[in-house]
């Protein structure tokens, strides 16, 4: 004969656990039904009564099976700085994430507590590093024979251009400008291409890159806010 | 409004039994959920539990006192009654009666009735 | 059975004062924890149910918190009329009181 199935509420067997969805009540010594996701007990089982559930109210939330007295409260509304990518319902929490243009200083469990707007690199300084979701932008100085002319945060070093008569030579912070005849750009083998951070909608369709000719000085700057002789700026 | 008052004897002699009726209004011991309890306070000491009833006839008991207690429920009347046997002075205390939420905290309390046990 | 140790068992403020008491249980009682307040001669009175949760009409001063074993009651800036004795009540597992905090003013 097949074991008979039981219904909540149940004693389980000595050293058994209870069932998928059923918690073990330490009152009743019993196996009870979890209430499902959206729900929370109102009234907790008995050893003849099983849990009674009831919806969560609104901007409350239960995410898992559970047996809780009262659902979760929903994290407050997203802040200017960010976009609701989850909204709270009774099943999940709400989720804000930082809009483009800016990083997560401050993550917490799910989403955002704190974002920050992406270091923008000064002109004569180019992007090392490109923000992400959860990291800002680092600049470094434009080595000799690069340079970029943008307060931003997606812009390289790009080469200078390569005149066949210079009129003005290129310094970090402006490209060289050639006589009349047309300039031919120089080309380094192998460079790599920087790609564009996830947190912003700038659309860089051929970021140049840097020049193997010189020798390179560049650093990198740290991730903390830099003064503007450092070549960044918090705009 | 909830309201709960207890009632039974000031004065039990050792060894007696003492029955105790709690009177309550507002809720029922028929809905779903709906539980009354009883706790004591012996003079200047803490409060402890004692027994309660759920609204199916389920009951509950103080592990260390199980065997002096029985509570029994008249759903008609609005009444629980806890009887609790062999009384000694020690059992000397204020006795409340209280409901208990679906999620088994105590919310709503009766005002209490002083139970003396001396021969 | 649960026990809860419930400290100090009483203790002397100013009025303004924040006031803290805590319960410690034997054993995990997954948040299930209540707060009374019972003045001299009176039944004790729900102030707080599941850790944190504030019973209707009950003054935003006083406030609770914990996990697992541990729990913190706290009164943000100690009345005159909140003079009484405080209980903690676990009802995890059963239901036990804790021994009581009693609070008076300096």
């Known amino acids: 004969l097949p074991a008979q199935v039981a219904f909540t509420p149940y004693a389980p067997e000595p050293g058994s656990t209870c069932r998928l969805r059923e918690y073990y009540d330490q009152t009743a010594q019993m196996c009870c039904s979890k209430c499902s996701p959206g729900q929370h007990a109102k009234v907790f089982c008995t050893k003849t009564s099983d849990t009674v559930c009831d919806s969560c109210e609104d901007s409350t939330y239960t995410q898992l099976w559970n047996w809780v007295p009262e659902c979760l409260s929903c994290g407050s509304r997203c802040s200017s700085d960010q976009v609701e990518t989850q909204a709270c319902t009774r099943e999940q929490n709400r989720i804000c994430t930082c809009r483009p243009g800016w990083y997560c200083a401050l993550s917490k469990q799910e989403g955002c507590r704190l974002c920050a707007p992406l270091r923008k690199c000064r002109p004569g300084f180019g992007v090392a590093r490109p923000g992400t979701e959860t990291s800002d932008v680092v600049c470094k100085p434009c080595a000799p024979g690069t340079f970029s002319n943008t307060t931003s945060s997606t812009d390289i070093c790009r080469p200078h251009q390569i005149c066949n008569v210079v009129a003005i030579p290129g310094n970090a912070s402006m490209d060289a400008v050639c006589t009349s005849t047309s300039p031919t750009r120089s080309m380094a083998p192998g460079a790599v291409h920087l790609p564009q951070p996830v947190s912003t909608r700038s659309q860089h369709t051929q970021p140049t890159p840097e020049p193997s000719t010189a020798p390179s000085t560049s650093f990198l700057l740290p991730m903390g806010p830099s003064p503007p002789a450092e070549g960044s700026t918090g705009d | 409004q909830v309201t709960l008052k207890e009632s039974g004897p000031a004065l039990v002699k050792p060894t007696q039994t003492l029955t105790l009726t709690c009177t309550f209004s507002g809720f029922s011991l028929s809905t779903s959920g709906m539980g009354v309890g009883w706790i004591r306070q012996p003079p200047g000491k803490a409060l402890e539990w004692l027994a309660h009833?759920?609204?199916?006839?389920?009951?509950f008991y103080n592990p260390s006192l199980k065997s002096r207690l029985t509570i029994s429920k008249d759903t008609s009347k609005n009444q629980v009654v806890l009887t609790m046997t062999n009384m000694d002075p020690v059992d000397t205390a204020t006795y409340y009666c209280?409901?208990?939420?679906?999620?088994?905290?105590?919310?709503?309390w009766g005002q209490g009735t002083t139970v003396t046990v001396s021969s | 059975d649960v026990q809860m140790t419930q400290s100090p068992s009483s203790l002397s403020a100013s009025v303004g004062d924040r006031v803290t008491i805590t319960c410690k249980a034997s054993?995990?009682?997954?948040?299930?924890i209540a707060w009374y307040q019972q003045k001299p001669g009176k039944a004790p009175k729900l102030l707080i149910h599941?850790?944190?949760t504030l019973q209707p009409g009950i003054p935003s001063r006083f406030s609770g918190s914990g996990s697992g074993r541990d729990y913190t009651f706290t009164i943000s800036s100690l009345q005159p009329e909140d003079i009484a004795t405080y209980y903690c009540?676990?009802?995890?597992?059963?239901?036990?009181f804790g021994g009581g905090t009693k609070v008076e003013i300096k």
């Open positions: 599941y850790t944190s």
């Open positions: 209280a409901r208990l939420t679906g999620t088994r905290y105590f919310d709503y």
């Open positions: 054993q995990d009682i997954n948040k299930f």
């Open positions: 009833i759920w609204w199916d006839d389920d009951k």
């Open positions: 009540l676990q009802y995890g597992n059963l239901w036990t």
